[in-house]
């Protein structure tokens, strides 16, 4: 039994890191393998992650971690029984994929303005709380070409757009994702989408 693709890990910079790797043949990850991990820290202890299958030869492990700080470094040991298959390390701050924003809501009762709000996925004491920027994706269910992205580069988790920038009388969906420039993160997954019917009063034409 050998490792074909070494484990690569990504952290949510809060409490979970996800490591994926591939073996050289079909493997029952949960019965044959164990990923041991430990924070390099005087008061830390070793933890064991039981991997799950991720395709025939692929394995994935979800590591429960202490709240992350930038200096953290974890040692990783991949075992098959008594055989050490791979040894490595992982700095969560260097491989961050933020959590997806939640609670996306579209407020349509503001005069001819759409207000989209969502929740920051981090608590206020987390470093990323004040460093996230967002991308909002709005698209029409009726017209695949009617697809737009709004970049929200300020900290407030909200976006205002004129209802008239969208077509009236049809349904739209929106979703939002996040990233943090400070740690050069990847984008988060998209939030669940929310749907609304766009309608607004056409202004009277002046003759």
């Amino acid at each position: 039994m050998k490792v074909l693709q070494e484990p690569t890990c990504v952290s949510d910079y809060m409490s979970i890191s996800t490591c994926e790797w591939k073996m050289n043949g079909p493997t029952n990850c949960s019965t044959e393998l164990r990923l041991l991990y430990q924070l390099v820290f005087l008061l830390s202890e070793a933890h064991t992650c039981i991997p799950e299958n991720n395709g025939g030869a692929g394995c994935v492990c979800h590591l429960l971690m202490d709240d992350v700080v930038s200096a953290d470094n974890y040692t990783l040991d991949l075992w098959a029984g008594q055989q050490l298959l791979w040894k490595g390390s992982f700095k969560p701050s260097e491989h961050v994929k933020p959590r997806a924003p939640g609670n996306l809501t579209v407020h349509t009762n503001v005069s001819d303005t759409l207000l989209l709000t969502w929740s920051n996925p981090y608590p206020p004491d987390n470093y990323l709380y004040n460093h996230l920027t967002y991308a909002v994706n709005i698209w029409s269910e009726n017209d695949p070409a009617d697809f737009r992205i709004y970049n929200v580069t300020y900290l407030e988790p909200s976006l205002r757009i004129a209802a008239s920038t969208l077509k009236s009388g049809i349904s739209y969906r929106a979703r939002v994702r996040a990233w943090a420039q400070c740690y050069n993160t990847t984008w988060s997954e998209w939030s669940p989408s929310t749907k609304w019917h766009n309608s607004y009063r056409e202004p009277f034409e002046q003759h």
Partner: antibody
Framework: EVQLVESGGGLVHPGGSLRLSCAAS????????MFWVRQAPGKGLEWVSG???????SYADSVKGRFTISRDNAKNSLYLQMNSLRAEDTAVYYC?????????WGQGTLVTVSS | EIVLTQSPGTLSLSPGERATLSCRAS???????LAWYQQKPGQAPRLLIY???SRATGIPDRFSGSGSGTDFTLTISRLEPEDFAVYYC??????????FGQGTKVEIK
């Protein structure tokens, strides 16, 4: 908002015992190492003890064998059991949250050891 | 045990002046684990700098940290009235644990 509130300080005779408590709120207590740091009157800061999320502990040489740090994650509380107290243990005792450094501190509780 | 020695013991300066505080370690310290704190009378310490040079949340940019190995520096570019306080450096070591310097008092001249 992160809050750390110490209690249990007071006047104790040399050789006596005291138990300090620290009530934590505003963060996930169970995922954080916790510490006690003290400051004698007019003196500098001295790290006393720390406890990891899994219960691993460490102590300054000056308190080893006399002080015991513990935590109750269900109650979001940190404790310091201090036995065989000496005059030189007189200090303000701060509860702190952190790891390699301490971003969050309580306001401290005063322990006075005197006959 | 790693010993941190801060100098000077007291720094007498006027508002608007530049303050340079030194912290010297008895053996090499990882920059990732060197921090600076400010403490005012009757208050808990406040983290200013971590990782030798990163400002903590909410700390004004007049505070900066630098250094590596055994020599570290905290600089306050222009002293404001609220900056007069005691400053401590602190290090963490995987085997020795946590230690603080003895402090530098920045007082009004």
């Amino acid at each position: 908002e992160v809050q750390l509130v110490e209690s249990g300080g007071g006047l104790v005779h040399p050789g006596g015992s005291l138990r300090l408590s620290c009530a934590a709120s505003g963060f996930t207590f169970s995922r954080n190492a916790m510490f006690w740091v003290r400051q004698a009157p007019g003196k500098g800061l001295e790290w006393v003890s720390g406890i990891g999320t899994g219960g691993a502990t460490s102590y300054a040489d000056s308190v080893k064998g006399r002080f015991t740090i513990s935590r109750d994650n269900a109650k979001n509380s940190l404790y310091l059991q201090m036995n065989s107290l000496r005059a030189e243990d007189t200090a303000v005792y701060y509860c702190a949250r952190g790891r390699y450094y301490f971003p969050w501190w309580g306001q401290g509780t005063l322990v006075t050891v005197s006959s | 045990e790693i010993v941190l020695t801060q100098s000077p013991g007291t720094l007498s300066l006027s508002p608007g002046e530049r303050a340079t505080l030194s912290c010297r370690a008895s053996q090499s310290v990882s920059s990732s684990y060197l921090a600076w704190y400010q403490q005012k009378p009757g208050q808990a310490p406040r983290l200013l700098i971590y990782g030798a040079s990163s400002r903590a949340t909410g700390i004004p940019d007049r505070f900066s940290g630098s250094g590596s190995g055994t020599d570290f520096t905290l600089t306050i570019s222009r002293l404001e009235p609220e900056d007069f306080a005691v400053y401590y450096c602190q290090q963490y070591d995987h085997s020795a644990g946590w230690t603080f310097g003895q402090g530098t008092k920045v007082e009004i001249k």
